[in-house]
Interface confidence: low
């Protein structure tokens, strides 16, 4: 019968002919009376056989990622009679893996949006690298993920590529972060290959800033002839948040005379001081009122950022008009 062991050839071997193993008949007594032949795809071009001994060699560099096994046929003939000594037999040559492929991130570019001030542990995005090497061959395709850029704000789970928040971030300080993730095969051991990807993480706004008046004192004037409903000036607060988180409402906090009102222009986010009652220079020629400003929408969990509304003082001078 036929005698052989399992045949393996490492991929990417640079030797001009790499000995793989030996095929022989147990009837072969070593006196060179038998002839061995190799048939099938790759016979003669990729693999050759020593016709006298049955030793098989690879004569080309092989790439396991291109082709991982070859199915060949063997024959053995008695040279004297030309007859087959053994029935033709099929055998397999497996191409064994070496770590010659770096991990690749196939779904680039990565981009994620996460609310600012999200707590530690919040999931941001999962990145996944692929390694063309053999997952069943040692650690050649076993990947570990690590963070090259993004500390101390982000962390990556080493085995899953899940990116999480590791420290609170404030959009008003920085609204986007570039995180660089490395995937390393061989579970980080010597000889490991690596690939990197960039993840753009954008912070969405939460209402963690209250509006604050630009000035602590505004000076306005009103003519005593002004009718009620007259706009006598504007006041303005600023809010570091954006969008609806920066929408604000102005109101009167203190006006003993109940002469003025403030309405909010929701397009410009200005407060418009309105005359509610007519004024009389001869009766009172100046007024002092206090205004406050608050955000329009404040979720309950963000109320701690909105204690004590910002206030401002408005001094209003009444202008005299000649009366008949």
């Amino acid at each position: 019968g036929w005698v052989w062991n399992q045949f393996f050839v490492p991929e990417e071997m640079n030797t001009t002919s790499h000995h793989i193993g030996q095929l022989r008949s147990d009837l072969d007594n070593g006196n060179n009376s038998f002839q061995y032949k190799l048939l099938g795809a790759g016979a003669g071009s990729t693999f050759i056989i020593d016709e006298r001994t049955g030793d098989i060699y690879a004569i080309q560099k092989l790439d396991r990622e291109e082709r991982s096994l070859y199915i060949l046929r063997a024959q053995v003939i008695d040279i004297a009679t030309g007859r087959a000594v053994e029935p033709e037999s099929e055998f397999v040559i497996k191409v064994s893996d070496i770590n010659d492929n770096e991990p690749k991130f196939l779904d680039e570019p990565y981009e994620a949006i996460v609310p600012e001030m999200s707590p530690e542990g919040t999931l941001v995005i999962q990145v996944t690298a692929s390694d063309a090497d053999d997952p069943s061959s040692g650690n050649n395709a076993r990947l570990l993920y690590s963070l090259l850029q993004g500390q101390p704000y982000f962390s990556v789970e080493p085995t899953t590529g899940v990116i999480r928040i590791s420290s609170k971030m404030d959009r008003e300080l920085q609204d986007e972060y570039w995180v660089i993730i490395q995937a390393k095969d061989m579970i980080g051991q010597p000889g490991a290959l690596s690939g990197t990807t960039s993840v753009l993480i954008k912070l969405s706004d939460v209402n963690d800033n209250k509006p604050i008046f630009k000035e602590s004192l505004y000076r306005l004037t009103v003519s005593e002839s002004a009718p009620t409903g007259t706009s006598i000036g504007t006041i303005m607060a600023y809010d570091n948040d954006i969008g609806e988180n920066a929408e604000m409402d102005y109101s009167i906090e203190e006006d003993d005379s109940q002469t003025f009102d403030i309405i909010t222009n929701h397009e410009t986010q200005e407060g418009i001081v309105i005359l509610k009652k007519k004024v009389d220079f001869e009766h009172q020629n100046h007024y002092g009122i206090r205004a406050k400003v608050k955000n329009h929408h404040v979720p309950e969990q963000l109320m701690k950022y909105h204690t004590e509304a910002s206030t401002t003082f408005i001094k209003i001078q009444v202008e005299d008009v000649d009366e008949p």
């Epitope: 530690e120 420290s167 609170k168 404030d170 008003e172 300080l173 604050i212 701690k304």
Partner: antibody, heavy 120, light 111 residues
Framework: QVQLVQSGAEVKKPGASVKVSCKAS????????MSWVRQAPGQGLEWMGI????????TYAQKFQGRVTMTGDTSTSTVYMELSSLRSEDTAVYYC?????????????WGQGTLVTVSS | QSVLTQPPSASGTPGQRVTISCSGS????????VNWYQQLPGTAPKLLIY???QRPSGVPDRFSGSKSGTSASLAISGLQSEDEADYYC???????????FGGGTKLTVLS
């Protein structure tokens, strides 16, 4: 280089109040929180409270609620810490420390400290 | 009793590596930056490590910080006599809505 210069040492009787000042320079005063931290003789650091000079927002440690008042004067870039109903255990060095632009960011610069002695 | 727990003392000889731990909870170390301060005798505290592991300019790279879960640690390698000081960890606490300090660790450099 940021500078925080505190007022001089004080000796007070039990029951009195003390007001310590901290003058800031070489940075935008209204952008950063300011904390007050005290250290009793031979003891560790104890956070008292924090103020944002721009809006006057304050947060006080539970222990000092009702006894401490922190204020800021933007015209002179100075913050003040007033502690009332003093008792002997309030004898300590009081430090002002500049925080970040958020409540939860580190204190990067400290004043030289003001020794307050409470003794009858 | 401090919210953050530090060993009261630590020691080492010149050239040695010393580690100081700081243990807290989810509401402080678990969800905020850890900072370390060095206080030399008779002086104001000085920021040594901020945002868990960053060093301000002028702080030697012998000092390093790390954080894992609800604990943090300060490591000092190549210990020098001038490192003899008190070391405090500090962190913002979300539950208390305020800052908390560790009780402090007195580091002695043995000659």
């Amino acid at each position: 280089q940021v500078q925080l210069v505190q007022s001089g040492a004080e000796v007070k009787k039990p029951g009195a109040s003390v007001k310590v000042s901290c003058k800031a320079s070489r940075y935008t005063f209204t952008s950063y929180y300011m904390s007050w931290v005290r250290q009793a003789p031979g003891q560790g650091l104890e956070w008292m409270g924090i103020i944002h000079p721009s809006g006057g927002d304050t947060t006080y440690a539970q222990k000092f609620q009702g006894r401490v008042t922190m204020t800021g004067d933007t015209s002179t870039s100075t913050v003040y810490m007033e502690l009332s109903s003093l008792r002997s255990e309030d004898t300590a060095v009081y430090y002002c420390a500049r925080g970040g632009i958020k409540l939860w960011l580190h204190f990067d610069y400290w004043g030289q400290g003001t020794l307050v002695t409470v003794s009858s | 009793q401090s919210v953050l727990t530090q060993p009261p003392s630590a020691s080492g000889t010149p050239g040695q590596r010393v580690t100081i731990s700081c243990s807290g909870s989810r509401s402080n170390i678990g969800s905020n930056f850890v900072n370390w301060y060095q206080q030399l005798p008779g002086t104001a505290p000085k920021l040594l490590i901020y945002t868990n592991n960053q060093r301000p300019s002028g702080v030697p790279d012998r000092f390093s910080g790390s954080k894992s879960g609800t604990s943090a640690s300060l490591a000092i390698s190549g210990l020098q006599s001038e490192d003899e000081a008190d070391y405090y960890c500090a962190v913002y606490d979300d539950s208390l809505n305020g800052w908390v300090f560790g009780g402090g660790t007195k580091l002695t450099v043995l000659s």
